[in-house]
């Protein structure tokens, strides 16, 4: 297993609709054809997997149907979007990139993006 540098923004504020997008960029040392991207959430000392996708270079990322993540790739950059976020989901989201094929296997983990989520103000009751 070889180490690889992964860069991601330090802080992002999600939209009022609970959507946060950020780029995860990795310094690929070779010509990988198969890449796996995993988003991890760290809260206190607990780390949980948010979503993961494996893609072939040049193809779209495919997350599971019920995943809260979507993404696109361009070269060594992956543009990740996490939706359905609530205020309680505020936390550190870490991008993990694995170059699966061809060998050698490379692993890179970013410093994390602190995502802040603001619950929208409830709409005032309307008199209908």
């Amino acid at each position: 297993c070889k180490a690889m540098h992964v860069a991601q923004p330090a802080v992002v504020l999600a939209s009022s609709r609970g959507i946060a997008s950020f780029v995860c960029e990795y310094a690929s040392p070779g010509k990988a054809t198969e890449v796996r991207v995993t988003v991890l959430r760290q809260a206190d000392s607990q780390v949980t997997e948010v979503c993961a996708a494996t893609y072939m270079m040049g193809n779209e990322l495919t997350f599971l149907d019920d995943s809260i993540c979507t993404g696109t790739s361009s070269g060594n950059q992956v543009n990740l979007t996490i939706q359905g976020l609530r205020a309680m989901d505020t936390g550190l989201y870490i991008c993990k990139v694995e170059l699966m094929y061809p060998p050698p296997y490379y692993l890179g983990i970013g410093n994390g993006t602190q995502i802040y989520v603001i619950d929208p103000e409830p709409c005032p009751d309307s008199d209908f």
């Epitope: 923004p9 330090a10 802080v11 992002v12 504020l13 999600a14 939209s15 997008s21 950020f22 205020a87 309680m88 505020t90 550190l92 410093n111 994390g112 602190q114 802040y116 989520v117 603001i118 619950d119």
Partner: antibody, heavy 118, light 110 residues
């Protein structure tokens, strides 16, 4: 070296607006946020709101909602805070602070004194 | 009024130990912890301690932070004249969707 340099002192009349700038250097501006904090004479620190330089999204303190606007110009790595309908109790030193990894206010500007007086 | 409660002042002798407290609730300090800032008269605040109780580089080991439940503490050992300053705690409040400050504690070194 990370630096946040703010614009100079301002004297304004009640009802007017003020726009304070905060020019950042020494880091990738769009990877971080900028928070604004004010301090009235002899008082403690009050959080006003923040902007994510990455996407321009903002989050304002409830009590200032509707009177404050925070923006960034990523081409010059500068953040702005505009406060409207100024009152005498808005007299304060206004600070910008970088919101860093983990959401820490890790670097601060030197402060801008805004005096509201008729 | 401040969401986080800090004693207004603490006085200790030279080379003594001062412990500052910051009490919040489960939405702020109890949830994420608190950061500590030091502010000398006429200067901007400076980050002293991260909410995970680590120190930024360049901050003396004499400053150490801890947390128990919804109360964060900052301990200053071997007090020096230059430690005379205002100390603020700061936390993200998940229910207010806002950062909240404590009212500050003025530390006097006798």
């Amino acid at each position: 070296e990370v630096q946040l340099v703010q614009s100079g002192a301002e004297v304004k009349k009640p009802g007017a607006s003020v726009k304070v700038s905060c020019k950042a250097s020494g880091y990738t501006f769009t990877s971080y946020g900028i928070s604004w904090v004010r301090q009235a004479p002899g008082q403690g620190l009050e959080w006003m709101g923040w902007i994510s330089a990455y996407n321009g999204n903002t989050n304002y303190a409830q009590k200032l909602q509707g009177r404050v606007t925070m923006t960034t110009d990523t081409s010059t790595s500068t953040a702005y805070m505009e406060l409207r309908s100024l009152r005498s109790d808005d007299t304060a030193v206004y600070y910008c602070a970088r919101v860093g990894y983990g959401g820490y206010f890790d670097y601060w500007g030197q402060g801008t004194l805004v005096t509201v007086s008729s | 009024s401040y969401e986080l409660m800090q004693p207004p002042s603490v006085s200790k002798g030279l080379r003594q130990t001062a412990t500052l407290t910051c009490t919040g609730n489960s939405n702020n300090v109890g949830n994420q912890g608190a950061d500590w800032l030091q502010q000398h008269q006429g200067h901007p605040p400076k980050l002293l301690s991260y909410r995970n109780n680590d120190r930024p580089s360049g901050i003396s080991e004499r400053f150490s932070a801890s947390r128990s439940g919804s109360t964060a503490s900052l301990t200053i050992t071997g007090l020096q004249p230059e430690d005379e300053a205002d100390y603020y705690c700061l936390a993200w409040d998940s229910s207010l969707s806002a950062w909240v400050f404590g009212g500050g504690t003025k530390v006097t070194v006798l």
